[in-house]
Amino acid sequence: ATKLTEEKYELKEGQTLDVKCDYTLEKFASSQKAWQIIRDGEMPKTLACTERPSKNSHPVQVGRIILEDYHDHGLLRVRMVNLQVEDSGLYQCVIYQPPKEPHMLFDRIRLVVTKGFSGTPGSNENSTQNVYKIPPTTTKALCPLYTSPRTVTQAPPKSTADVSTPDSEINLTNVTDIIRVPVFN
């Protein structure tokens, strides 16, 4: 059985989550990829996705989420900027591969965002923010909606213990309520 494991990040409000999801180059380089949140007792919800086909090194910005797919590295880079306490939750990268079910990339990210001062005295906070002043991408394609009889009806427990699952291709039903809102001028 494939284990679903979690990696935990505890960050402060205003900081940036910056993670990379590794994928098989030959199989998935141009496949559409997505960033999802899994709330307790709910289906995974798609927050942002790359274009289809996914473009190399082309940033897609959805609100405070920035996705960049690096085909030459086999990595999807996900950044969530200006984090808020409400962003706390369990996240995952998936690859869309219709008509098959989405393929989950390991590991899931347990994000904990707390209130408080995010830097140290004299820390250069502005320099981190400047990195993300990229023009937002306008793409017409929304993330696909999947329905399947093998739906996940319960989110995994909040503990960081391993959770067994029958195979690595977890079925994920995704929503399409994505609004691309530019947040940087």
């Epitope: 590295h73 086999g74 981190t128």
Partner: antibody, heavy 119, light 108 residues
Framework: EVQLLESGGGMVQPGGSLRLSCAVS????????MSWVRQAPGKGLEWVSE????????YYADSVKGRFTISRDNSKNTLYLQMNSLRVEDTAIYYC????????????WGQGTLVTVSS | EIVMTQSPATLSVSPGERATLSCRAS??????LAWYQQKPGQAPRLLIY???TRATGIPARFSGSGSGTEFTLTISSLQSEDFAVYYC??????????FGQGTKVEIK
């Protein structure tokens, strides 16, 4: 329990070759990037090379590029470092390290294997 | 290449006292920074990652803070087992992944 065990170190003359191995257990090896990190006697840590899990992408420090080759055999749960054209300054303890899935930080380390390059 | 600079090189502290170690990056690394502890004859051990997240099994007396270019590792009350060398490491963008030169925490 996660375990990483390096082997293959030893003494070699400048210009010579060595192949280091790192046998791992306790986690799904094929899913994670792995790195080699070295430490010269009495000195600090220096990242040497990385091989990603799913993509198989490889990266090298400038100091070893063209001389060292990282590889892995997922069926044997083993990471390798082929070191050619060795120099005196390559003398160090070589550690293999497991990386986080989501970033290149090293959450588990082997005990290291000593490579001595001397004439 | 991002250069990591740690200070001081050596820190002399009495057991029970507070220790504050600094790490500076030559350019912003967001919060993509880790701290490691290394004792003589042993491999490094991950303490903190993401600048402030404690790794599994690390005592609460270890805490990390900072963002951008300036980072701090604080040991609130030094225990005998905490005397060691501490390294910071950035994992921002792409390799090479670079370490600071280390700070040795010794008994005063």
């Amino acid at each position: 329990e996660v375990q990483l065990l390096e082997s293959g170190g030893g003494m070699v003359q400048p210009g010579g070759s060595l192949r280091l191995s790192c046998a791992v257990s306790g986690f799904t090896f094929s899913r994670y990037a792995m790195s080699w990190v070295r430490q010269a006697p009495g000195k600090g840590l220096e990242w040497v090379s990385e091989m990603r899990g799913s993509s198989g992408s490889t990266y090298y420090a400038d100091s070893v590029k063209g001389r060292f080759t990282i590889s892995r055999d997922n069926s044997k749960n083993t990471l390798y470092l082929q070191m050619n054209s060795l120099r005196v300054e390559d003398t160090a303890i070589y550690y293999c390290a497991k990386e986080f899935s989501s970033n290149s930080l090293f959450d588990y380390w082997g005990q290291g294997t000593l490579v001595t390059v001397s004439s | 290449e991002i250069v990591m600079t740690q200070s001081p090189a050596t820190l002399s502290v009495s057991p029970g006292e507070r220790a504050t170690l600094s790490c500076r990056a030559s350019q912003s690394v967001n919060v993509n920074l880790a701290w490691y502890q290394q004792k003589p004859g042993q491999a490094p051990r991950l303490l903190i990652y993401g600048a402030s997240t404690r790794a599994t099994g690390i005592p609460a007396r270890f805490s990390g803070s900072g963002s951008g270019t300036e980072f701090t590792l604080t040991i609130s009350s030094l225990q005998s087992e905490d005397f060691a060398v501490y390294y910071c490491q950035q994992f921002y963008n792409w390799p090479p992944w670079t370490f600071g030169q280390g700070t040795k925490v010794e008994i005063k």
